[in-house]
C-alpha cells in the first residue's frame, strides 16, 4: 500500500503518469550503480532492502557516494552529459560509488507533470539513503547529490526528507519554471545539505528562464553573469547554415553547468575561481575581485565549503570550452581631462604583456560611462596565463568600426563641435589579478606624454608592486 507522507497525504497520489503506462511503472525510480567508466557496461541496479547487489557490485561503504540525478527529458534516454559526468567522477574519485538515479518514467512527461513528480523521486532517494545508513560504516557525510536542472530540486527534496543531513548537494543550473520564488521546502535550498553549491548558467531576466535566477544554495555561482555562455551563441552552435535551432542554444547554455562541473573534476590543475559580488553589473565593472573574508572560491567539485548566514552570489568569466578557466584582472584607470570635453565614450583596448605570454587585444567594457577626473574600474580577462605582467598597451580606437561607434562619434561632435582635439590624460594603471590577488602599478612609459586621443596608444610599464604610490594619501573608499 502507498506510504502516507506528512500533511500532504499519500506520496503515490503525486505520481503524474500517462494512463497508458500507469500499470507499467513499478518501481518508478531505479538506482544504477555505475561500476565502470565504460558507458556500455550496464552497471548494477541497487534494490532497497536487498544487500546482495551491494556486495556483488562492490559498493564501498566507507567511500564517497555520488548520486547523479537527471532532469526533465523529452527523449526518455540519458543524454551524453551524464556519461561524461559518470566518467569524470570515476576518474577523480577512483574508489567512490557513482549511482545514477534513473527516474525516466516520471521525467519523460509534460514538464508540469515531471515537476509534480520531483517530490516522490526525492522521497525515493531519501528512503534509499535511510536504508544505506543502517549499514555499518556508511555515512551521510560522504554523500554528494548532484542534480541537473529539475534533478537539482529532486536532490533538494531528498536532502529534506532523509533522516540526518547529506554532506553536499550540487545544483547544476536548477530548473526555473515553477520553482522561481517558491517556498524553500518546495525547491532546492541551503538547509537541504551541510553544503549546497549551485551553478547558474541559463538565467534570463526577460523571456523564459530555463534555470532558476534566485540564489538557492550556500554559494550560488553565475558564470558569465549566469546568462549568455561563450560558445553557445547561434553562430557557434549552428555549425553550418543548414543546422541548428534556438533549442540548441538553450541546451548549450543550460547544460554548460554540467560541463563546468566536469571540468572541475578532470582539470584539477586549472581551477576556475569565482568572486563574490552583489550583482553581475558590478562584477563586469571589475569591482569584485577580492578573496578577503572568503569572497572568492573555486567552482564545481573543488568549491570550499562556505556556510554563510545568507546566500553568497559569485561571478566569473569562462572560456567557450574545456578547460574553462580564465585569468581575471581588475584595472583601475584614473582619467584626467584638461579640457571640458562634455560626455565622452571612448572605445579603449588593452594588450597585456607578461613573462609567459602576451594577451590578445582586449576591449575595456564600459558598463556605464567613463568618469572624467575620477578613477574608473574595468574587468579584463585572458584565456592564457600571462605570468607576471610587465607592460600594458592602451589604445583608443580611432576610425569607427561600427555604426554604433559612428553614432557615438557624431553625437560627441554635435555636443562639442568646436572641440576637435578630444584628449584624455592617463598617468598610470593599477592592476589586480583575481587569481593571485597580486596588485601592481603601471606608469606611463613617458611621464611627459600621458595624453591619449582617438587612434592613439599609450604604453605603461610596471613601476611598482602594490598600488600605493609615494606621496599618495590613502584612498577614502576601500574597494571590496
Amino acid at each position: 500500500s502507498p506510504t502516507p507522507f506528512g500533511p500532504e497525504g499519500q506520496l503515490e497520489d503525486e505520481l503524474h503518469k500517462p494512463k497508458a503506462i500507469q500499470t507499467e511503472v513499478k518501481p518508478s525510480v531505479r538506482f544504477n550503480l555505475r561500476t565502470s567508466k565504460d558507458p556500455e557496461h550496464e552497471g548494477c541496479y541497487l534494490s532497497l532492502g536487498h544487500s546482495q547487489p551491494l556486495e556483488d557490485c562492490g559498493f564501498n561503504m566507507t567511500a564517497k557516494t555520488f548520486f547523479i540525478i537527471h532532469g526533465w527529458t523529452m527523449s526518455g534516454i540519458f543524454e551524453n552529459w551524464l556519461h561524461k559526468l559518470v566518467s569524470a567522477l570515476h576518474t577523480r574519485e577512483k574508489d567512490a560509488n557513482v549511482v545514477v538515479v534513473d527516474w525516466l518514467p516520471l521525467a519523460h512527461q509534460l514538464y508540469t507533470d515531471a515537476v509534480n513528480n520531483t517530490r516522490v523521486v526525492g522521497h525515493s532517494i531519501a528512503r534509499m539513503l535511510d536504508w544505506l545508513q543502517e549499514k555499518d560504516d556508511f555515512s551521510l557525510e560522504n554523500v554528494h547529490l548532484i542534480g541537473y536542472s529539475l534533478g537539482a530540486h529532486v536532490a533538494g527534496y531528498a536532502g529534506n526528507f532523509v533522516k540526518g543531513t547529506v554532506g553536499r548537494i550540487t545544483g547544476l543550473d536548477p530548473a526555473g519554471p515553477m520553482f522561481e520564488g517558491a517556498d524553500i521546502h518546495k525547491r532546492l535550498s541551503p538547509d537541504d545539505a551541510d553544503f549546497v553549491d549551485v551553478l547558474h548558467t541559463y538565467t534570463r531576466s526577460f523571456g523564459l528562464s530555463i534555470g532558476i535566477q534566485m540564489p538557492v544554495g550556500h554559494i550560488d555561482i553565475y558564470p558569465n553573469g549566469g546568462d549568455f555562455q561563450p560558445g553557445c551563441g547561434l553562430n557557434d552552435v549552428l555549425g553550418s547554415m543548414a543546422y541548428g535551432t534556438i533549442t540548441e542554444v538553450v541546451k548549450c547554455e543550460h547544460e554548460r553547468a554540467v560541463h563546468l562541473f566536469v571540468d572541475s573534476l578532470v582539470n584539477q590543475d586549472k581551477p576556475s575561481f569565482a568572486f563574490q559580488c552583489t550583482d553581475s553589473n558590478r562584477f563586469k565593472k571589475g569591482i569584485c575581485l577580492s578573496c578577503r573574508k572568503n569572497r572568492c572560491n573555486s567552482i564545481g567539485y573543488n568549491a570550499k565549503k562556505m556556510r554563510n548566514k545568507r546566500n553568497s552570489k559569485m561571478y566569473l568569466k569562462t572560456r567557450a570550452g574545456m578547460p574553462f578557466r580564465v585569468y581575471h584582472y581588475q584595472m583601475k584607470i584614473h582619467v584626467f581631462s584638461y579640457k571640458n570635453m562634455g560626455e565622452i565614450e571612448p572605445t579603449f583596448y588593452v594588450t597585456l604583456y607578461g613573462t609567459n605570454a602576451d594577451s590578445q587585444t582586449l576591449p575595456l567594457e564600459i558598463v556605464e560611462r567613463i568618469e572624467q577626473n575620477a578613477t574608473n574600474t574595468f574587468l579584463v580577462y585572458t584565456e592564457e596565463d600571462l605570468g607576471d605582467l610587465l607592460k600594458i598597451q592602451l589604445t583608443w580606437e580611432g576610425a569607427s568600426q561600427s555604426w554604433y561607434n559612428l553614432w557615438k562619434e557624431l553625437r560627441s561632435y554635435l555636443s562639442q563641435p568646436h572641440n576637435p582635439g578630444r584628449e584624455l590624460n592617463i598617468r598610470r594603471i593599477r592592476v589586480k589579478s583575481g587569481e593571485t590577488q597580486r596588485k601592481l602599478t603601471f606608469c606611463a612609459e613617458d611621464p611627459e606624454n600621458t595624453s591619449i586621443s582617438p587612434g592613439r596608444e599609450l604604453w605603461f610599464r610596471k613601476c611598482r608592486d602594490g598600488w600605493r604610490m609615494k606621496n599618495e594619501t590613502s584612498p577614502t573608499v576601500e574597494l571590496p
Epitope: A20, I21, E24, V25, S28, R30, N32, P39, E40, E42, Y45, S75, G76, I77, F78, E79, N80, L82, H83, D102, L104, P105, H108, V237, L238, G239, S240, Y243, G244
Partner: antibody
C-alpha cells in the same frame, strides 16, 4: 548470447497497417533501449525512433511521428513497431537494434531485418 | 539534423590491402561516432563505438580514429569477409543519423 529475432517478410496493399515484432533474448530486456531503423532499397539507414522497455516511453524521429507506433510486451521481451497508412514509400527493410542507456551508446546488436513490400 | 557524409560510395581493393573509409559530420559530434558493417545478406554488425573502441569479437585489423567533424575507419589487412558496406552513425544529438554507406568491393 544477445539475440534479436524479427518477424518475417510482409506484402501489403497501400493504406493497410502492419505490426513488426522483435523478440529479445540473452540479456535483461529492461536494461537497454530498442530502436528501429529503416533501409529503403539500396539506400542508407534512417533512425525511426526508440522505446525504453523499462516503462514504455518512446521518442520518434519527427519524420516518422505519424507513421510509426512503438510498443513493448515486457512479459515476452518483445518490441513491436506498427506502421500505418502504408504507401510504396514505406517499402523497405526494417531493423530493430539494441542500444545502451545513453544517446552515445552504439546500436550494439541488430535484428536480421524484416522486409516490407507495399504494392497494389 | 546532423548530416553524416561518406563521400566515397564505392571502393575497390584487394585481399591484404589497407583501406580507409571516411565520414564527415555537419558539426562537431564530440567523438560520438560508431561504425557498422552490413553484409550482402543484410546482416548488420557493430564494429567500433566512440570513434575508436573496438566492439567485442571484432578483429583487431579494424580501427577507428578522428575528432570534431572528421572520422575514419581503417581496415589494415583486408580479408575476404571484410567485403561489405560500411556505415558511420553519430550518437551526439537526436535524431541519430547515418552516413550513406561505403561499399567495399574486391578488385
Amino acid at each position: 548470447e544477445v539475440q534479436l529475432q524479427q518477424s518475417g517478410p510482409e506484402l501489403l496493399k497501400p493504406g493497410a497497417s502492419v505490426k513488426i515484432s522483435c523478440k529479445a533474448s540473452g540479456y535483461t530486456f529492461t536494461d537497454n533501449t530498442i530502436h528501429w531503423v529503416k533501409q529503403s532499397h539500396g539506400k542508407s539507414l534512417e533512425w525511426i525512433g526508440h522505446i525504453n522497455p523499462y516503462y514504455g516511453g518512446t521518442n520518434n524521429n519527427e519524420k516518422f511521428k505519424d507513421k510509426a507506433t512503438l510498443t513493448v510486451d515486457k512479459s515476452s521481451s518483445t518490441a513491436y513497431m506498427e506502421l500505418r497508412s502504408l504507401t510504396s514509400e514505406d517499402s523497405a527493410i526494417y531493423y530493430c537494434a539494441r542500444k545502451g542507456i545513453y544517446y552515445s551508446s552504439p546500436f550494439d546488436y541488430w535484428g536480421q531485418g524484416t522486409t516490407l513490400t507495399v504494392s497494389s | 539534423d546532423i548530416q553524416m557524409t561518406q563521400t566515397t560510395s564505392s571502393l575497390s581493393a584487394s585481399l591484404g590491402d589497407r583501406v580507409t573509409i571516411s565520414c564527415r559530420a555537419s558539426q562537431d559530434i564530440n567523438n560520438y561516432l560508431n561504425w557498422y558493417q552490413q553484409k550482402p545478406d543484410g546482416t548488420v554488425k557493430l564494429l567500433i563505438s566512440y570513434t575508436s573502441k573496438l566492439h567485442s569479437g571484432v578483429p583487431s585489423r579494424f580501427s577507428g580514429s578522428g575528432s570534431g567533424t572528421d572520422y575514419s575507419l581503417t581496415i589494415s589487412n583486408l580479408e575476404r569477409e571484410d567485403f561489405a558496406t560500411y556505415f558511420c552513425q553519430q550518437g551526439n544529438t537526436l535524431p541519430f543519423t547515418f552516413g550513406s554507406g561505403t561499399n567495399l568491393e574486391i578488385k
